[in-house]
Amino acid sequence: QNASRGRRQRRMHPNVSQGCQGGCATCSDYNGCLSCKPRLFFVLERIGMKQIGVCLSSCPSGYYGTRYPDINKCTKCKADCDTCFNKNFCTKCKSGFYLHLGKCLDNCPEGLEANNHTMECVNIVHCEVSEWNPWSPCTKKGKTCGFKRGTETRVREIMQHPSAKGNLCPPTNETRKCTVQRKKCQKGERGKKGRERKRKKPNKGESKEAIPDSKGLESSKETPEQRENKQQQKKRKVQDKQQKSVSVSTVH
């Protein structure tokens, strides 16, 4: 079959050769491949000012393979497309274009935004935050004793950071004023801010049991002051639910 194709072409092109390189079925000195062996794709390759035919098992970047009965060729992707699956489905756009559903666009459609890293049109992502954590104990200057009016804080986490066009995150810290029954600070007490109750070294002559840690709070060896503080916290939680107090928000 290839020989007959070679004979046919020789009459039309004086330089046709049957001993073709690579996957050519027929070729000529001037044009390179004229036709390809089965399953190979014909493509024009630019060599300087000249274009010559070559036969490849797969198409180069910027082309896709088109198969018709017994004749395959590499067909150019659209002008704005770098790599494509077929004529109507681009997989990578040329610089300055954004990929969306296989198409290359100058601008992304409504409801989508351009990702300048992947050069794709992506869904707008809005900020998502967790529920508020409980309020911290009432403190003043880092201490939980020795005052009547202080502040308490609560925080929440950012679960999903927003994309460029997404809604910004709301504040993740909230602080408000609080009032407690003044309690005297015990000798050497450093305030034990928040929930972090660090075990401190006992003073000389003081037993370890006398300094409460988080376990100690739950033990039967609670001091009257500690019990009172606990009751105040419970009272605040009830008040919290009953009325919304004025809160001072700070974004962190």
Epitope: Q1, N2, S4, R5, R7, R8, Q9, R11, M12, H13, A25, T26, C27, S28, N31, G32, C33, L34, S35, C36, F42, L44, Q51, I52, G53, T66, Y68, P69, D70, I71, K73, T75, K76, K78, A79, K87
Partner: antibody, heavy 119, light 107 residues
């Protein structure tokens, strides 16, 4: 030199099937791609379809449902059948050949045969 | 399908004139373009293939150029035998489509 000669009835009745044959000399139809092209009087050219060296066919989607292209390698001929014809199918029908993307497209043509669709 | 828009549809020229016929494809056809000459009552004859390659035996006054979607056939010095209708054909994909033709008449 490759020669192609079309043959078949010059008059076909509407709704009937148009049948044409192209006889090839100077080359074997088991190489290359063998095409049918038509040209309505005073109008442009329209590609109908091809039959390949292995006997596979591809038709213009605008005519596909009505077109059948076949071959007889023993006679070195290929044929066109166009069903359910109307006056719009009146044209000069040509057979032509090409040998691949790198060579001349439709390097050889038949002289053409006029088919008139009329009752 | 790829549409081929040929212009002008007709032109009048004199022997010795330089004639230019253009064909515009509806999309990039990557140089897969041929030009044909057809005289009344005759089959078309291939002049040029792959945009700019002359078929053996075609006079060198015929030349082709172009890329992407825009292609041109130029006859550098029109001869009496060149008065005919010229067609472009794309073969970048199937179905193949021809331009509607340009009739070159004697002025």
């Amino acid at each position: 030199e490759v020669q192609l000669v079309e043959s078949g009835p010059g008059l076909v009745k509407p709704s009937e099937t148009l049948s044409l044959t192209c006889t090839v000399s100077g080359d074997s139809i088991t190489s290359g791609y063998w095409n049918w092209i038509r040209q309505p009087p005073g109008k442009g050219l329209e590609w109908i379809g091809y039959i390949s060296y292995s006997g596979k066919t591809y038709q213009n989607p605008s005519l596909k449902s009505r077109v059948t292209i076949s071959r007889d390698t023993s006679k070195n001929q290929f044929s066109l059948k166009l069903s359910s014809v109307t006056a719009a199918d009146t044209a000069v029908y040509y057979c032509a050949t090409y040998y691949g993307y790198g060579g001349p497209w439709f390097a050889y043509w038949g002289q053409g045969t006029l088919v008139t669709v009329s009752s | 399908d790829i549409q081929m828009t040929q212009s002008p549809s007709s032109l009048s020229a004199s022997v010795g004139d330089r004639v230019t016929i253009t064909c515009k494809a509806s999309q990039d056809i990557d140089s897969y373009l041929s030009w044909f000459q057809q005289k009344p009552g005759k089959a078309p004859k291939t002049l040029i293939y792959l945009t700019n390659r002359l078929v053996d035996g075609v006079p060198s006054r015929f030349s082709g150029s172009g890329s992407g979607t825009d292609y041109t056939l130029t006859i550098s010095s029109l001869q009496p035998e060149d008065f005919a209708t010229y067609y472009c054909l794309h073969y970048d994909e199937f179905p193949l489509t021809f331009g509607q033709g340009t009739k070159v008449e004697i002025k």
